[in-house]
């Protein structure tokens, strides 16, 4: 019997020869459990599993606690990965953090993170980021050190509101915070001077909702 | 839509006084803070005066305490700073903002500059003799 191929991430996907962008099935670590992935084989050297993209507005991202652990969207258009599978990446893994972002103007930058990964469940998938670099602001807009996930059933923030209920979209807020790339997504001209929109402040600065955003992870030693 | 527009600005001599308004619509101020901001040529934007119009909380920046007096109509859903003593270091392009009142951490009683997601164009105030 055949022994199937099995790859954690888009990393490996690669490096197996499969070079072409596009959806791939991915396996948990240690696990038969199994989650479809979009692997951007172009960007950057290629090899790049994408966790988050929003373009279009077309996907609900004000969701459950329980829609963010397992993932939800189409990896061909908008989606959240889901953080169950983040986090046991990350955690056997040393794993850098790329966010690409686009402005209604024609503009792109981004922000890469040297070392990324989620705590587990127990510590609600709190984010851990060391080592910006990038384009997208020399602060970083995800707040440090790392908060944990919140959304709009599950509140975790520092704040004496509930940040997800209030900006709307699961997301590491802190008080809120300068960041929310899970906003609710604002068409061009209807973007600006937005409590709730797609914000990554030390790029575009406050109330700016970005037009597209793609967050990814590598191994770091890809 | 919601949208913030300064007021008042303008050439005034040391010493002398200007009211600023920034009148607000798309949102009630009740739910609302308002800060008053500066940035002048070549510095960073900096915070100057807040108010919480809810519960009538006020913050000043240590530079104007004294001198300037922000309040609040919320009949006309305007904020004013009043700004008496004025000195040639207060030159500056001045903005209103907008946070959510709600939105602040456990402990604290103002808001990051980062918080305040809706601006207005801002009003040039010139102190000079």
């Known amino acids: 019997k055949e022994e199937k191929t099995t790859f954690r991430d888009c990393a490996e996907i690669f490096k197996s020869g499969l070079t072409t962008s596009g959806i791939y099935t991915l396996t948990f670590p240690n696990s038969t459990e199994e989650v479809k992935a979009y692997c951007d084989m172009d960007m950057g050297g290629g090899g790049w599993t994408v966790i988050q993209h929003r373009e279009d507005g077309s996907v609900d991202f004000q969701r459950t606690w329980k829609e963010y652990k397992e993932g939800f969207g189409s990896p061909l258009g908008e989606y959240w990965l889901g953080n169950e599978f983040v986090s046991q990446l990350t955690s056997g893994h040393r794993y850098v953090l790329k966010i690409q972002l686009k402005d209604w103007e024609g503009s792109e930058a981004h922000s890469l993170y040297e070392h990324f990964y989620l705590s587990g469940e127990e510590s609600n998938y709190r984010i851990h980021l060391t080592g910006l670099t990038g384009t997208a602001g020399k602060i970083s807009s995800i707040s440090q050190p790392g908060s944990d996930f919140s959304t709009k059933d599950s509140d975790n923030d520092k704040c004496i509101c509930k940040c997800s209920q209030m900006l709307t979209g699961g997301w590491w807020f802190d008080a809120c915070g300068p960041s929310n790339l899970n906003g609710q997504y604002y068409p061009q001209k209807q973007n600006t001077n937005k409590f709730n929109g797609i914000k990554w402040y030390y790029w575009k600065g406050s109330g700016y909702s970005l037009k597209a955003t793609t967050m990814m992870i590598r191994p770091a030693d890809f | 839509d919601v949208q913030l527009v300064e007021s008042g600005g303008g050439l005034v001599q040391p010493g002398g006084s200007l009211r600023l308004s920034c009148a607000a619509s798309g949102f009630t101020l009740d739910d609302y803070a308002i800060g008053w901001f500066r940035q002048a040529p070549g510095k960073e934007r900096e915070g100057v005066s807040a108010i919480r119009s809810s519960g009538g909380s006020t913050y000043y920046a240590d530079s104007v305490k004294g001198r300037f007096t922000i309040s609040s109509d919320n009949s006309k859903n305007t904020v004013y700073l009043q700004m008496n003593s004025l000195r040639p270091e207060d030159t500056a392009v001045y903005y209103c903002?907008?946070?959510?009142?709600?939105?602040?951490?456990?402990?604290?009683?103002?808001?990051?500059?980062?918080?305040?997601?809706?601006w207005g164009q801002g009003t040039l105030v010139t102190v000079s003799s």
């Open positions: 903002a907008a946070v959510p009142a709600g939105r602040l951490r456990f402990g604290e009683q103002w808001y990051p500059l980062y918080e305040y997601d809706a």
